[in-house]
Amino acid sequence: EPPTACREKQYLINSQCCSLCQPGQKLVSDCTEFTETECLPCGESEFLDTWNRETHCHQHKYCDPNLGLRVQQKGTSETDTICTCEEGWHCTSEACESCVLHRSCSPGFGVKQIATGVSDTICEPCPVGFFSNVSSAFEKCHPWTSCETKDLVVQQAGTNKTDVVCGPQDRLR
């Protein structure tokens, strides 16, 4: 009876279990009753990082110098190239597909430390009593407006992203 499942590092094809190609190699032809799976090594600028049945290897990532990228770790037949940014610049994401001079702190966060040539912007959440309603690479959290000092009352509470809204006091008639 033909198998319905195969062992690890095998795949089912034509009611038969064939060996997967090892990392760094691509599939040329499936196994048969009489022959093993045929695999070929990936080319110079290609890779496959898993046991696979892919017929094409993936291209190594290109670290585009026009985007400020450079190679941190050269790719192999089994691993992709890892990019990083030029000195003083910072990756915009884990994948490092582009570079920024410094990250900004989102609304609700203030700048704790402005970026330098070696370290990116350090953000901190605005604590109770403070807010930031902008994305910025230099602005700290701002204190809520003090309604009392203006002889007003709080009409709307502040949040980490919004200031309080002050209004006139109710006058007793």
Epitope: N66, G68, S98, V100, L101, H102, S136, E139
Partner: nanobody, 116 residues
């Protein structure tokens, strides 16, 4: 496409003044925090000054505090840097930058040389 065109650089004697301008296009200038950064020969980029979108809040690096003034004219989509009491160590290519400052957003910069 973001375009930033810096101008106003030149050769100036120590103690002299220059006013740099940056003409912005390709984005809504009034919505963005803007920066001036500089790169001295053989050095990395240094953050010089920044201004919030409304022009009401500013930042200055310690090295230029009290000598440089950043400003903006949102009606003209232009950023300025007034540089007074210039020193030899202010010699650099000056770039204006929009937040976030993407590497490929850089303009050509304007060269400021302070020398006697």
């Amino acid at each position: 496409e973001v375009q930033l065109l810096e101008s106003g650089g030149g050769l100036v004697q120590p103690g002299g003044s220059l006013r740099l301008s940056c003409a912005a296009s390709g984005f809504t200038f009034r919505d963005y925090e803007m920066w001036w950064v500089r790169q001295a020969p053989g050095k990395g980029l240094e953050r010089v000054s920044a201004i919030n979108p409304q022009g009401t809040r500013t930042y200055y690096a310690d090295s230029v505090m009290g000598r440089f003034t950043i400003s903006r004219d949102n009606s003209k989509n232009t950023l300025y840097l007034q540089m007074n009491s210039l020193r030899a160590e202010d010699t650099a290519v000056y770039y204006c930058a929009k937040l976030p400052f993407m590497f490929d957003d850089r303009g050509q910069g304007t060269l400021v040389t302070v020398s006697s």
